[in-house]
């Protein structure tokens, strides 16, 4: 699990409720005016447009993607940025707004007729960090499930994990993505820190299977941070 910049924030001084929300018991609680950032000793005022820190696209909204705010900027500082509209430049599908996908570095409409014949070509262009899809979160990148008649077997190209058969996930392999086995107990896994390393993996591993989490192997606790081996272990 990624340790977010926002991990363990205190939300304080919730303002008075704004009145009942339809379909929900009670009333809506409006946004908090201040949060405590870890390590900080003062509450910061926030507004609706304060950048939201992220480590992967799925921490952002459906109309956003996760990236460094400046070109060539510090990979350790990523925020949710507004998605790119049609004909805007892109590097991966998640950068394009819903209804579009990234083809040859440009966001293009994913209307089915013109998408259908280009799926194969497009998949190989996806450089995106796709923990997304790792656990079935519907992502805009997207190949409609109607277009896939059979689930991908190990080694099949994919856009997201739901394209793969049970026990497989969609993970990067060179610059394309293929179905790979979900990790079993004792197998080496990748524990992502917030430094942007996630986006640099050429051979991405799947996540650990159900009931397992990626933790430092017991006998490696003494090792230096950089050489610690993580394996899938029971919760």
């Amino acid at each position: 699990t990624l340790n977010s910049v926002l991990n363990s924030n205190a939300i304080k001084n919730l303002p008075p409720p704004l009145g009942g929300a339809a379909g929900h018991p009670g009333s809506a609680v409006s946004a908090a005016p201040g949060i405590l950032y870890p390590g900080g000793n003062k509450y910061q005022t926030i507004d609706n447009y304060q950048p939201y820190p992220c480590a992967e696209d799925e921490e952002c909204g459906t109309d956003e993607y996760c990236a460094s705010p400046t070109r060539g900027g510090d990979a350790g500082v990523q925020i949710c940025l507004a998605c790119r509209k049609r004909r805007k430049r892109c590097m991966r599908h998640a950068m394009c707004c819903p209804g579009n996908y990234c083809k040859n570095g440009i966001c293009v409409s994913s209307d089915q007729n013109h998408f259908r014949g280009e799926i194969e070509e497009t998949i190989t262009e996806s450089f995106g960090n796709d923990h997304s899809t790792l656990d079935g979160y519907s992502r805009r990148t997207t190949l409609s499930s109607k277009m896939y008649h059979t689930k991908g077997q190990e080694g099949s190209v994919c856009l997201r994990s739901s394209d793969c058969a049970s026990g497989l996930c969609c993970a990067r392999h060179f610059w394309s993505k293929i179905c790979k086995p979900v990790l079993k107990e004792g197998q080496v896994c990748t524990k992502h820190r917030r430094k942007g390393s996630h986006g640099l993996e050429i051979f991405q591993r799947c996540y650990c299977g159900e009931g397992l989490s990626c933790r430092i192997q017991k006998d490696h606790h003494q090792a230096s941070n950089s050489s610690r081996l993580h394996t899938c272990q029971r919760h």
Epitope: L2, S4, N9, A21, H24, S27, V29, A31, Y52
Partner: nanobody
Framework: EVQLVESGGGLVQPGGSLRLSCAAS?????????MGWFRRAPGKEREFVAA????????FYADSVKGRFTISADNSKNTAYLQMNSLKPEDTAVYYC?????????????????????WGQGTLVTVSS
């Protein structure tokens, strides 16, 4: 539509602990952007208690519970939890588990805004000697 069922409430003495559970059915927790706990004390409005992002990497707490309560989720069990320690009489309330879909735009405020969530029926926690 997700069904959320809370359990673990009850009577506890001040300084005691309780662990609330929230079992989701009809939908998996990992398809939600955030899980949260809210509470409503007798005669008061419902208030935000804690929330956790889908990845589990981001947690938020109301100032009143910070350091005493811990929110967590186990996607494999489709269950969210609220560990409540050092309970005080003012923590007495009906506690609601809630699940929020992914927003169009991410913001800190999203996590504490109750109108974004689907709700469970609630479980009563009474802190009294």
């Amino acid at each position: 539509e997700v069904q959320l069922v809370e359990s673990g409430g009850g009577l506890v003495q001040p300084g005691g602990s309780l662990r609330l559970s929230c079992a989701a059915s009809g939908y998996t927790l990992k398809n939600y952007y955030a899980m949260g706990w809210f509470r409503r004390a007798p005669g008061k409005e419902r208030e935000f208690v804690a929330a956790i992002s889908r990845s589990g990497g981001t947690t938020f707490y109301a100032d009143s519970v910070k350091g005493r309560f811990t929110i967590s989720a186990d996607n494999s069990k489709n269950t969210a939890y609220l560990q409540m320690n050092s309970l005080k009489p003012e923590d007495t309330a009906v506690y609601y588990c809630a699940a929020a879909p992914r927003p169009k735009r991410a913001s800190v405020q999203y996590f504490s805004t109750s109108s974004n969530y689907d709700w469970g029926q609630g479980t009563l926690v009474t802190v009294s000697s």
